[in-house]
Interface confidence: low
């Protein structure tokens, strides 16, 4: 299958979704976001060994060329394949507003 | 601007489009592709320093958390923002066929 799901490095070490707890201060948002005070940021972390969750043909090419020219071509990288929306309560001049961000939390991951 | 385009590492060192010349053998395609014999593979290579070509909010978060927790959270990664199509002449049981691949050659790059 194009999108191999077996991680040769051991479980949890290849590209997958991780949760990182972050405060508004960590994110540099304290001056413009009221809530939530803490965000469970889902992000894509892990190695992308040969053909693991290859997103597309480009990722497969990258794997082949990285094997041949590791100093020139980097290995594929673990990035979001899609996102979950998140609502932030923001400070405004007149009070507060609710804003939905569609590109904030990773939903699932692939290698590209 | 959210997507800063100034590379603090020096010209050409940050995330951008590069061309890598590759033969069918390099790509492992010699058994199923007839033409072209050589591909000018456009791919995204380079560093993603703070806010450089940040693709979205997620990339900005990643930058912030990488600064705080560099061992846990990787820096954003240079990946294709879009692709150029490419036509391959493929071998088939009955002869040859033309197949267009939409996800083969990077067109432009961003950090995510």
């Amino acid at each position: 299958a194009r999108n191999g799901d077996h991680c040769p490095l051991g479980p949890g070490r290849c590209c997958r979704l991780h949760t990182v707890r972050a405060s508004l201060e960590d994110l540099g948002w304290a001056d413009w976001v009221l809530s939530p005070r803490e965000v469970q940021v889902t992000m894509c972390i892990g190695a992308c060994p040969s053909q693991f969750r290859a997103a597309n043909m480009h990722a497969q090419i990258k794997t082949s060329l990285h094997r041949l020219k590791p100093d020139t071509v980097p290995a594929p990288c673990c990035v979001p394949a899609s996102y979950n929306p998140m609502v932030l309560i923001q400070k405004t001049d007149t009070g507060v507003s609710l804003q939905t961000y569609d590109d904030l939390l990773a939903k699932d991951c692939h290698c590209i | 601007a959210r997507n800063g385009d100034h590379c603090p590492l020096g010209p050409g060192r940050c995330c951008r489009l590069h061309t890598v010349r590759a033969s069918l053998e390099d790509l492992g395609w010699a058994d199923w592709v007839l033409s072209p014999r050589e591909v000018q593979v456009t791919m995204c290579i380079g560093a993603c320093p703070s806010q450089f070509r940040a693709a979205n909010m997620h990339a900005q978060i990643k930058t912030s958390l990488h600064r705080l927790k560099p061992d846990t959270v990787p820096a954003p990664c240079c990946v294709p923002a879009s692709y150029n199509p490419m036509v391959l002449i493929q071998k088939t049981d009955t002869g040859v066929s033309l197949q267009t691949y939409d996800d083969l050659l990077a067109k432009d790059c961003h950090c995510i």
Partner: antibody, heavy 119, light 107 residues
Framework: EVQLVQSGAEVKKPGASVKVSCKAS????????LNWVRQATGQGLEWMGD????????IYNQKFKGRVTMTVDTSISTAYMELSSLRSEDTAVYYC????????????WGQGTLVTVSS | DIQMTQSPSSLSASVGDRVTITCKAS??????LAWYQQKPGKAPKLLIY???SLETGVPSRFSGSGSGTDYTFTISSLQPEDIATYYC?????????FGGGTKVEIK
């Protein structure tokens, strides 16, 4: 032989918390992710989240976000799932399940822990 | 979240019959599908993973097929001990989700 042994049944009042344990044996504990799945009486299966004992990476089902906490004690090969602010609809059998080597299918399951929430 | 729609919700068949259960995902899950058997009062038991791979020790009368969004689970010759509820589960994208289950009974 792989075994996952869970703690015993619990009866809790609404608003309380429950902590279920899952002791693993028969394999290298840090080599496999552990998941928690629940099943209300006569209902289907619902995934709550998973925990990587190697690096303590956790993915929670957003449905339970803020109410569920998954932890691990690698020294005794035991995983824990704590659910807070219990309500009657949390009455269910809670299972721990070991993830497969190549993906999040569940190849070994605990015997289940019945949690009853009743006033 | 990826929704898994399993059908039928129940079926009745005779010993020796071929039994087929289908599972439809709300988006492509790239073969990341498992099938489980659950008997009353017991934990689920893994039968199939990767849409088609038979778990070690599972009888060969159980099989799986499919791709994209559509998957099928088959018992080639129903046996009395196969009476149970069967669930599909996707593990392409968290939250990992299960189908609603199919209760298999003997006629």
């Amino acid at each position: 032989e792989v075994q996952l042994v869970q703690s015993g049944a619990e009866v809790k009042k609404p608003g309380a918390s429950v902590k279920v344990s899952c002791k693993a044996s028969g394999y290298t504990f840090t080599d496999y992710n552990l998941n928690w799945v629940r099943q209300a009486t006569g209902q289907g299966l619902e995934w709550m989240g998973d925990l990587n004992p190697y690096n303590q990476g956790i993915i929670y089902n957003q449905k339970f976000k803020g109410r569920v906490t998954m932890t691990v004690d690698t020294s005794i090969s035991t995983a824990y799932m704590e659910l807070s602010s219990l309500r009657s609809e949390d009455t269910a059998v809670y299972y721990c399940a070991r993830e497969g080597r190549g993906g999040a299918w569940f190849d070994s399951w605990g015997q289940g822990t019945l949690v009853t929430v009743s006033s | 979240d990826i929704q898994m729609t399993q059908s039928p919700s129940s079926l009745s068949a005779s010993v020796g019959d071929r039994v087929t259960i289908t599972c439809k995902a709300s988006e492509d899950i790239y073969h990341r599908l498992a099938w489980y058997q659950q008997k009353p009062g017991k934990a689920p038991k893994l039968l199939i993973y990767g849409a088609t791979s038979l778990e070690t020790g599972v009888p060969s009368r159980f099989s799986g097929s499919g791709s994209g969004t559509d998957y099928t689970f088959t018992i080639s010759s129903l046996q009395p001990e196969d009476i149970a509820t069967y669930y599909c589960q996707q593990y392409w994208s968290p939250p990992f989700t299960f189908g609603g289950g199919t209760k298999v009974e003997i006629k």
